[in-house]
């Protein structure tokens, strides 16, 4: 029970009405540190008129029917106060002597018992008719979290008695539960911002501010959604929330206009081979919109080239791409551009890069293999392949010779210098087939092997040979 009141920093004396009896011996039993320095407190109404109360226990035993009903006395029902103020309130009850078993008073808030170091204190005032008990509760510097419904509980003769609630309403400035958020928007495209603040006290009204100017001279009830029809340049938005306690201001948020990205910077060549270049770059400013992909533009730097540009597309991340299928020993100009949803950036500054010399693209020609039986060697001859400038400078040849006979297989290779176009290889196995292939070598690597040339190595003097670089499936000529 109790009536709603506006009550801040109420002193204990104000909580009680009615005449005060003479001082009685007091059993002072605090549940935690007492909030008051006084050892004696005035009791509640002592006229012993027990109010009819819905919370009175239902007593059923024959003996109990003689007991008068017991209930908590009415107290203040609604306390309204500002944040950071102090508040004190109480429950009181008169227990006649006829009740033998009573337990302490416990405080509850919103259905949960308040345990631990709360500022509560219980005072007992005995007299010839029974005892008056006052449970006092105080909160220093109240916060919004102290809002709620407080009540007392007590067991009398094993029956639970509950007081009427005391509703504490802590009022303060509006409190933002949703502030506008930074967004990146397309130029001249509508977007929404949301602002929500709560009390108590309600209502909370919202004003929007754009670049230090109020958008609405009439406020909107919280929550408020501001629809901005479109922007052409970056703007800062915030909202003001007003209630009966004053005003608060949200954080200011930047609304950025999406633009094309800035060009990439720091384009570097990480590695070059004869036919590929590994390029890296640092993305430019993304224009307030995530980069989607990048384009690597490659053109031959030589004056004689026709100026056509090769374009290679790749994902925006990682900022790395291997350009392939390039000519060996060639000069290229390379630039990078990246795009977001608005469009492509300008290209980065062009940088020069070169591929290294390549491996030969053709195999040696006119391969002939002869068996020199007297020296037990193979005499191998060939013609130098036509090597282009970009294939690099010839440094030698690799000769692969495979020996096969019943139950035996031997795969060997020799490297010879570029001087001359012949080589001699000792016979490894008799009564066998020897397959010979030759590849040219430059600094750029090893070229393709020629087609295999087979020669049969007899047990004694009979020899078959294949005097050309075409495959020799069987005996082609004999010498």
């Amino acid at each position: 029970g109790g009536t709603a009141e506006k009550w801040e920093e109420t002193e204990l004396d104000q909580l009680f009405s009615g005449p005060l009896p003479g001082r009685l011996p007091v059993n002072h039993r605090p549940f935690s540190a007492p909030h008051s320095s006084r050892d004696q407190l005035p009791p509640p109404q002592t006229g012993r008129s027990h109010p009819a109360h819905t919370a009175a226990p239902q007593v059923t035993s024959t003996a109990s029917k003689l007991l008068p009903p017991v209930a908590f006395n009415h107290t203040i029902g609604h306390i309204v106060l500002s944040e950071h103020k102090n508040v004190k309130f109480n429950c009181s009850i008169n227990i006649p002597n006829t009740y033998q078993e009573t337990a302490g008073i416990s405080w509850w808030k919103d259905g949960k018992e308040l345990l631990g170091a709360h500022h509560s204190i219980t005072q007992f005032y005995p007299d010839e008719e029974g005892v008056s008990i006052i449970a006092l509760f105080s909160i220093a510097s109240v916060q919004r979290s102290d809002n709620g419904s407080y009540f007392c509980k007590m067991k009398v003769n094993n029956r639970e008695i509950v007081s009427d609630p005391i509703y504490v309403e802590v009022q303060g400035l509006p409190y933002f539960i949703k502030q506008p958020e930074s967004v990146n928007v397309t130029r001249n495209t509508a977007f929404n911002l949301t602002c929500q603040a709560v009390g108590p006290p309600e209502p909370v009204n919202i004003f929007w501010v754009q670049n230090s100017s109020r958008v609405n001279e009439k406020p909107e009830r919280s929550p408020s959604v501001l629809t901005v029809p479109g922007l052409t340049e970056t703007a800062v938005f915030s909202c003001e929330a007003h209630n009966d306690k004053g005003l608060t201001v949200s954080k200011g948020v930047h609304i950025n206009i999406k633009v094309i990205p800035s060009p990439p910077t720091e384009v570097h060549i990480l590695n070059s081979t004869a036919h590929s270049i590994l390029v890296s770059w640092v993305p430019g400013f993304d224009g307030y919109s995530p980069l989607q992909n990048c384009s690597i533009q490659v053109k031959e730097a030589d004056r004689l080239s026709n100026g056509s540009v090769m374009v290679f597309n790749t994902s925006a991340s990682p900022h790395l791409y291997e350009i392939q299928q390039l000519q060996a020993l060639a000069n290229y100009s390379i630039a990078v551009s990246c795009r977001n949803e608005i469009g492509w950036s300008a290209v980065s500054p062009w940088i020069l890069a070169s591929t290294t010399e390549g491996a030969p693209s053709v195999a040696p020609l006119n391969i002939t293999v002869f068996l020199n039986e007297s020296n037990n060697i193979l005499d191998i001859r060939w013609t130098k392949p036509p090597i282009k400038r970009q294939d690099g400078e010839l440094v030698g040849y690799r000769i692969s010779h495979v020996w096969e006979s019943a139950g035996t297989y031997k795969e060997l290779s020799e490297e010879v210098s570029q001087n001359g176009s012949w080589a001699q290889i000792p016979v490894q196995i008799h009564n066998a087939t020897c397959t010979v292939r030759i590849a040219a070598i430059t600094k750029g690597g090893i070229g393709p092997f020629s087609e295999p040339v087979n020669i049969i190595i007899p047990e004694h003097s009979k020899v078959d040979y294949a005097p050309s670089s075409t495959p020799a499936p069987g005996n082609t000529d004999s010498m």
């Epitope: 309600e202 004003f207 109020r214 004053g246 005003l247």
Partner: antibody
Framework: QIQLVQSGPELKKPGETVKISCKAS????????MSWVKQAPGKNLKWMGW????????TYADDFKGRFAFSLETSATTAYLQINNLTNEDSATYFC??????????????WGQGTTLTVSS | DVVMTQTPLTLSVTIGQPASISCKSS???????????LNWLLQRPGQSPKRLMY???KLDSGVPDRFTGSGSGTDFTLKISRVEAEDLGVYYC?????????FGGGTKLEIK
């Protein structure tokens, strides 16, 4: 108790500039705004606009855009009204009033004592 | 701007007698939120204005209940049931529904 104390009377010549102060006490300065009201002799009270004491965002009534500027010195809990290029028509008493938007609308609940500006050549 | 017109300009009343001041607006002061932002101020001689009433009829704290406000739309009235000496001064109505806020010309209450 909230108090708004304004600076003393001003005598200025046309073309000059005046800056009137309004010192607030008794409440958190940044939790409300300050309105300015002009009371010219024999004329209606005229609302000039208001400034948010937290953010400094100002709103001006149309008749007071241009030569008039509201400002703050938050650390000194003081609001200012500056009028540039004074004319004879600026002669009036200027009031500051605490302001924000409550459940009953604009509050206008506490007023300064007023500052009398006389513009005369 | 909304024009607020007060009548009479001057009101001479004997102490203990009632008084009535009228305020008319050039546009309805009923806002889209259902509230009517019509307010009254009292400026006692040599003092700054003081809020008296808001939302047509709600008294500010400390204002005696002999003051009552009424009206709707564009017509509003402030009544004093029994004038006392402390009531003398200039009464202003003002509206906060439309931008900019505007004031009436004032009604001077003097004691006969």
């Amino acid at each position: 108790q909230i108090q708004l104390v304004q600076s003393g009377p001003e005598l200025k010549k046309p073309g000059e500039t005046v800056k009137i102060s309004c010192k607030a006490s008794g409440n958190t300065f940044t939790t409300y705004g300050m309105s300015w009201v002009k009371q010219a002799p024999g004329k209606n009270l005229k609302w000039m606009g208001w400034i948010n004491n937290y953010s400094g965002v100002s709103t001006y009534a149309d008749d007071f855009k241009g030569r008039f500027a509201f400002s703050l010195e938050t650390s000194a809990t003081t609001a200012y009204l500056q009028i540039n290029n004074l004319t004879n028509e600026d002669s009036a008493t200027y009031f500051c009033a605490r302001d924000y938007y409550g459940s009953g609308g604009w509050v206008f609940d506490y007023w300064g004592q007023g500052t009398t500006l006389t513009v005369s050549s | 701007d909304v024009v607020m017109t007060q009548t009479p300009l001057t009101l001479s009343v004997t102490i203990g007698q009632p008084a009535s001041i009228s305020c008319k607006s050039s546009q309805s002061l009923l806002d889209s939120d259902g509230k009517t932002y019509l307010n009254w101020l009292l400026q006692r001689p040599g003092q700054s204005p003081k809020r008296l009433m808001y939302l047509v009829s709600k008294l500010d704290s400390g204002v005696p209940d002999r003051f009552t406000g009424s009206g709707s739309g564009t017509d509003f009235t402030l009544k004093i049931s029994r004038v006392e000496a402390e009531d003398l001064g200039v009464y202003y109505c003002w509206q906060g529904t439309h931008f900019p806020r505007t004031f009436g010309g004032g009604t001077k209450l003097e004691i006969k």
